[in-house]
């Protein structure tokens, strides 16, 4: 017995017609079961399979192979958080954070907490002390003076 188009099984009473639209993206196997087209999954074959590696938590897709990031996330796989705008020497674990690297401080991690080490401002053998963000003090050897022991 040969079934009519789109009918399958004993008695030809199983219906399956391929679709590729809002309601699903599937073909039909020899038994009339829905088989999702490449790039689609789910019982209704209407959920796209995202780019391999796309973060299941922070990325999604409406088309196969895509990876669209949630607000606050970036990168090819949507696995990198976006730090606070203007964050200079900082990183984030969650969106909009600015966690300062060593020796940096301030809301945007733009304040140097180790000005002495970074800039070595004290001349002529002066001893540098960090006194605050972007602040330092030079202790000058005998015979020298000025903010940087330059005189």
């Amino acid at each position: 017995v040969t079934c009519d188009d789109y009918y399958y099984g004993f008695g030809c009473n199983k219906f399956c017609r391929p679709r590729d639209d809002f309601f699903g993206h599937y073909a039909c196997d020899q038994n009339g079961n829905k088989t999702c087209m490449e790039g689609w999954m789910g019982p209704e074959c209407n959920r796209a399979i995202c780019r391999q590696g796309c973060s299941p938590k922070h990325g999604s897709c409406k088309l196969p192979g895509d990876c669209r990031c949630q607000y606050g996330w970036q990168g090819l796989y949507c696995d990198k958080c976006i730090p606070h705008p203007g964050c200079v020497h900082g990183i984030c674990n969650e969106p909009w954070q600015c966690l300062c690297e060593t020796n940096w401080g301030g809301q945007l991690c733009d304040k140097d907490l180790n000005y002495c080490g970074t800039h070595q401002p004290c001349l002529n053998g002066g001893t540098c002390s960090n006194t605050g963000p972007d602040k330092y003090q030079c202790s000058c050897p005998e015979g020298y003076s000025g903010p940087n022991c330059e005189i």
Epitope: F22, G42, P43, E44, N46, K62
Partner: antibody, heavy 116, light 107 residues
Framework: QVQLVQSGAELKKPGASVKVSCKVS????????IHWIRQAPGQGLEWMGI????????KYNQKFKDRVTMTVDKSTSTAYMELSSLRSEDTAVYYC?????????WGQGTLVTVSS | DIQMTQSPSSLSASVGDRVTITCRTS??????LTWYQQKPGKAPKLLIY???TLASGVPSRFSGSGSGTDFTLTISSLQPEDFATYYC?????????FGGGTKLEIK
């Protein structure tokens, strides 16, 4: 077991809006679309629209297009249907149903009465 | 929109009778057709999907046939619990529409 539990009856004035909820359990919420169907007293069934619960995309019956909004909250496995600018002819029982080769599962229905 | 014409709109029959309800569509919907049974105050119940597939738990006295534009729901031997209203619905394209219903009453 699969269950769709809808919010309680509503009495609304003409011009107001109503938002009906449909909380599902017993299966993965985002695996199946949710449809909304209504039935006026003593009348037949009328399909209002469908929402893809994974993406939140909706397709509406043109008759309701400008007045209906379907949404989902994946965190609570709940679908919502909001109908605005209500008029007396919107008095009906509103059903949600799980879509896939026919509606095997329905909510219990929510009666919305529109009266001044 | 696809129009669904269901007939008859009402029908009187007796227990044990064979009953046929028809549904005609305004264009080819292949087999994207569903039949429901509804009792007063209750949500509809799925009987048949894809024109002829019996839904889980539905008695075998119910059967569906047809494809394209002409469809039939048959109850081979009416039981007392079968007196209800029956609806056809297509799920081919948006909007999915229902037939007007057939009220099956006891003669």
């Amino acid at each position: 077991q699969v269950q769709l539990v809808q919010s309680g009856a509503e009495l609304k004035k003409p011009g107001a809006s109503v938002k009906v909820s449909c909380k599902v359990s017993g299966y993965a919420f985002t695996d199946y679309a949710i449809h909304w169907i209504r039935q006026a007293p003593g009348q037949g069934l009328e399909w209002m629209g469908i929402i893809n619960t994974y993406y939140g995309d909706s397709k509406y019956n043109q008759k309701f297009k400008d007045r209906v909004t379907m949404t989902v909250d994946k965190s609570t496995s709940t679908a919502y249907m909001e109908l605005s600018s209500l008029r007396s002819e919107d008095t009906a029982v509103y059903y949600c149903a799980r879509g896939y080769d026919g509606f095997a599962y329905w909510g219990q229905g929510t009666l919305v009465t529109v009266s001044s | 929109d696809i129009q669904m014409t269901q007939s008859p709109s009402s029908l009187s029959a007796s227990v044990g009778d064979r009953v046929t309800i028809t549904c005609r569509t305004s264009e080819n919907i292949y087999s994207y057709l569903t039949w429901y049974q509804q009792k007063p105050g209750k949500a509809p119940k799925l009987l048949i999907y894809n024109a002829k597939t019996l839904a889980s738990g539905v008695p075998s006295r119910f059967s569906g046939s047809g494809s394209g534009t002409d469809f039939t729901l048959t109850i081979s031997s009416l039981q007392p619990e079968d007196f209800a209203t029956y609806y056809c619905q297509h799920h081919y394209d948006i909007p999915w529409t229902f037939g007007g219903g057939t009220k099956l009453e006891i003669k």
